[in-house]
């Protein structure tokens, strides 16, 4: 750490006195102090001498000696008072700028330490401080206004009592700036705009900030627009609004519009797209397949996306059959708006019943006309099976009918003993029928197929089973020959009640 001679923290001299301050360090040293006249500086290796032979009140201040090469950054300081009976204050700056809630140092240095007891801070023209102003005083540094407020942006003077009268410093202007958290907040409305050629349109770009010093502009495809600005102040924020009014839009008005605002903290921008069309439009689409298959008893939501301008004048869901003339309940229809020109319409079909299969159509209307989008809903059913014994062309035949959706396939099993269902251990023979005869196959209905098994002689201690299955499930029917005729068993679990 460098050493200053004289080795005292404070030195008090009279105007006109000679002052010599010597600093010695291990390496080269440097002086730092208030900007003031009449000092001469002499450096010699590891020492530096600051001297004046005519000290004035303006030399009052703290002089610090540092050793630039010292990694610890050590320094030594001495405070010099030049006590001028006519000049109790040495003001180092006449303007101080701080942000709100910071401490503001008004750098009026007392030239005579004896005067400290009688100092005070006042405002120019003898006006007292506002009672809200809290300050402290240091003879070395001046007055510090603590946690300065914007309202304390005033002109101040430092006052000292000398021989019973108050002597003022020159004035110091304090500027307390509002803390600006960032670039101005922006809104650009609408977020998207569509108009038919010849219609009117309005685009509003507005910016707000706690400070009045900011700029805002609206640009179209990178061209700045000349629009008169409206200014306002509310909710403790300054607002600047640019309104673009277009009486009759044309295709050249279409494109990208950007609202841009900037202040000392930076820039914010937001954009929107303006589309100009020749005529009204109405487009319906769905992310879903228009052909839907759902298992009976389950639920389904049908969703339609609508893009339209102008807005919809009407819309509804309609059931087009074929089973009944019922219509979807309005409470199951739901509409959500994604944005101004895009909407989603949903029809909820919970716990579907057989009579609810068929065609569902969403219809919408706007000045561009009517549009419709139709869904085809087919219900899936597990197979239902029945077996009868009959004679065809004189031959004994087991006839198995299976109905379900999708189309069931059929397998015959012959097993030993009398049973409701053949298990693997009992199976004697298996026949697959790859091409059962389709008895009925209408849209939205179950498919009914028939499979024939010709049996020359019915074995009485055996069971003949017809099994049908599809992607939903399976069903079976066991046929047990008995001497008095044939006996059939449809297993309980395959009795189906939708």
């Amino acid at each position: 750490i460098p050493v200053i001679e004289p080795s005292v923290p404070e030195l008090v001299v009279k105007p006109g006195a000679t002052v010599t301050l010597r600093c010695v360090g291990n390496g080269s040293v440097e002086w730092d102090g208030p900007p003031s006249p009449h000092w001469t500086l002499y450096s010699d290796g590891s020492s530096s001498i600051l001297s004046t032979n005519n000290a004035t009140f303006q030399n009052t201040g703290t002089y610090r000696c540092t050793e630039p090469g010292d990694p610890l950054g050590g320094s030594a300081a001495i405070h010099l008072y030049v006590k001028d009976p006519a000049r109790p204050w040495n003001v180092l700056a006449q303007e101080v700028v701080v942000f709100e809630d910071q401490d503001a140092l008004l750098p009026c240095l007392l030239t005579d330490p004896v005067l400290e007891a009688g100092v005070s801070l006042v405002r120019v023209r003898g006006r007292p401080l506002m009672r809200h102003t809290n300050y402290s005083f240091s003879p070395w540094h001046g007055f510090t206004i603590h946690r300065a407020k914007f309202i304390q942006s005033q002109d101040y003077q430092c006052s000292a009592l000398m021989g019973g009268r108050k002597v003022m410093s020159i004035s110091i202007r304090l500027k307390v700036q509002k803390v600006i958290p960032g670039p101005p907040a922006l809104t650009l409305v609408p977020a998207e705009l569509v108009r038919i050629r010849g219609e009117a349109a309005q685009i509003v770009c507005s910016a707000s900030s706690v400070d009045v010093n900011f700029d805002v502009f609206l640009q179209h495809n990178n061209t700045k627009l000349a629009i008169p600005q409206q200014s306002d102040f509310h909710n403790n924020r300054y607002q600047k609004v640019l309104t673009l009014n277009l009486d009759q839009v044309d295709f050249q008005h279409a494109g990208n519009y950007s609202c841009v605002a900037s202040n000392v903290q930076g820039k914010h921008s937001t954009s929107m797209f303006f589309r100009v069309v020749e005529s009204a439009y109405l487009n319906l689409s769905s992310e879903q397949n228009l052909i839907q298959e759902v298992t009976v008893g389950e639920g389904l939501n049908l969703k339609v996306m609508v893009e339209a301008y102008p807005g919809l004048q009407g819309f509804n869901w309609t059931y087009l059959g074929p089973f009944s003339d019922h219509q979807p309940e309005p409470k199951l229809a739901n509409a959500t708006t994604k944005d101004t020109y895009r909407h989603t319409f949903t029809l909820s079909l919970p716990r579907l019943k057989p009579s609810e299969a068929g065609r569902y159509s969403f219809l919408a209307r706007n000045p561009g006309g009517w549009r419709a989008l139709t869904f085809e809903l087919t219900l899936r059913y597990p197979p239902e099976v029945s077996v009868i014994w009959t004679f065809i062309n004189g031959s004994g035949t087991l006839l198995c009918a299976a109905s379900g959706y999708p189309q069931p396939n059929v397998t015959w099993l012959q097993c030993s003993g009398h049973t409701d269902r053949c298990d693997e251990a009992q199976v004697l023979q298996v026949w697959d029928d790859p091409y059962p005869e389709v008895l009925s196959q209408e849209p939205f209905h179950k498919v009914t197929v028939q499979s024939l098994l010709t049996v020359e002689t019915l074995e009485h201690n055996q069971t003949y089973e017809c099994r049908a299955h599809n992607s939903v499930g399976s069903g079976s029917w066991a046929f047990i020959p008995i001497s008095a005729g044939a006996h059939t068993h449809p297993p309980d679990e395959f009795l189906f009640t939708p």
Partner: antibody, heavy 116, light 112 residues
């Protein structure tokens, strides 16, 4: 010329609220605190509180906390005082007054009468 | 709260007399920032208040020099050297140092 123009007299029912305005002109509104003072008939003066027009920060006399709310609208250079849950005790003349290290200018006063 | 006690409550005077009003605070009203926020106001019938003196002894602009203020700590005085007819009204002292700010009860200056 500094002027503080207050809203007109008010006759209100007990239990209701009232909002008194004070429009400032002839000076920069945001450079001075605004004070509010109550003068009851035949009584002395009571300081209600003050407000910094820049921030809306207020200091209240504890006696009026919950009774009075001070606000400002910088765009119109207007200070407001809302008084709520009014009783006959609130009948008085209310003044707004500018503060510059001292209260130097006063409004003409707003007479509030609370009566059923 | 700081209580401001004014005496007398009524002061009958003749035109040209000297008038003196006293105001005593229940505690020191020297602010931590070293200012003494003591003001004197005059209220004439049917009017609002007018500032006469601020900071104990400073005359507000436009106030005639026959008005003067003095005092320190807790004792303060307003003097009117030669009373004129237009000086009649109620005089209030006021302390602006401690919250809540408080007024004296007032002194009515009236002609004998």
């Amino acid at each position: 010329e500094v002027q503080l123009q207050q809203s007109g007299p008010e006759l209100v029912k007990p239990g209701t609220s009232v909002k008194i305005s004070c429009q400032a002109s002839g000076y920069t509104f945001t450079v001075y605190y605004m004070n509010w003072v109550k003068q009851s008939h035949g009584k002395s003066l009571e300081w209600i509180g003050d407000i910094d027009p820049n921030t809306g920060d207020s200091t209240y006399n504890q006696k009026f906390r919950g009774k009075a709310t001070l606000t400002v609208d910088k765009s119109s250079s207007t200070a407001y005082m809302e008084l709520r849950s009014l009783t006959s005790e609130d009948s008085a003349v209310y003044y707004c007054a500018r503060y510059d290290g001292y209260i130097d200018y006063w409004g003409q006063g707003t007479t509030l009468t609370v009566s059923s | 709260d700081v209580v401001m006690t004014q005496t007398p409550l009524s002061l009958p005077v003749s035109l040209g007399d000297q008038a003196s009003i006293s105001c005593r605070s229940s505690q020191s009203i020297v602010h931590s920032n070293r200012h003494t926020y003591l003001e004197w106001y005059l209220q004439k019938p049917g009017q609002s208040l007018k500032l006469l003196i601020y900071g104990v002894s400073n005359r507000f602009s436009g106030v005639p020099d026959r008005f003067s203020g003095s005092g320190s700590g807790t004792d303060f005085t307003l003097k009117i050297s030669r009373v004129e007819a237009e000086d009649m009204g109620i005089y209030y002292c006021f302390q602006g140092t401690h919250v809540p700010l408080t007024f004296g009860a007032g002194t009515k200056l009236e002609l004998k």
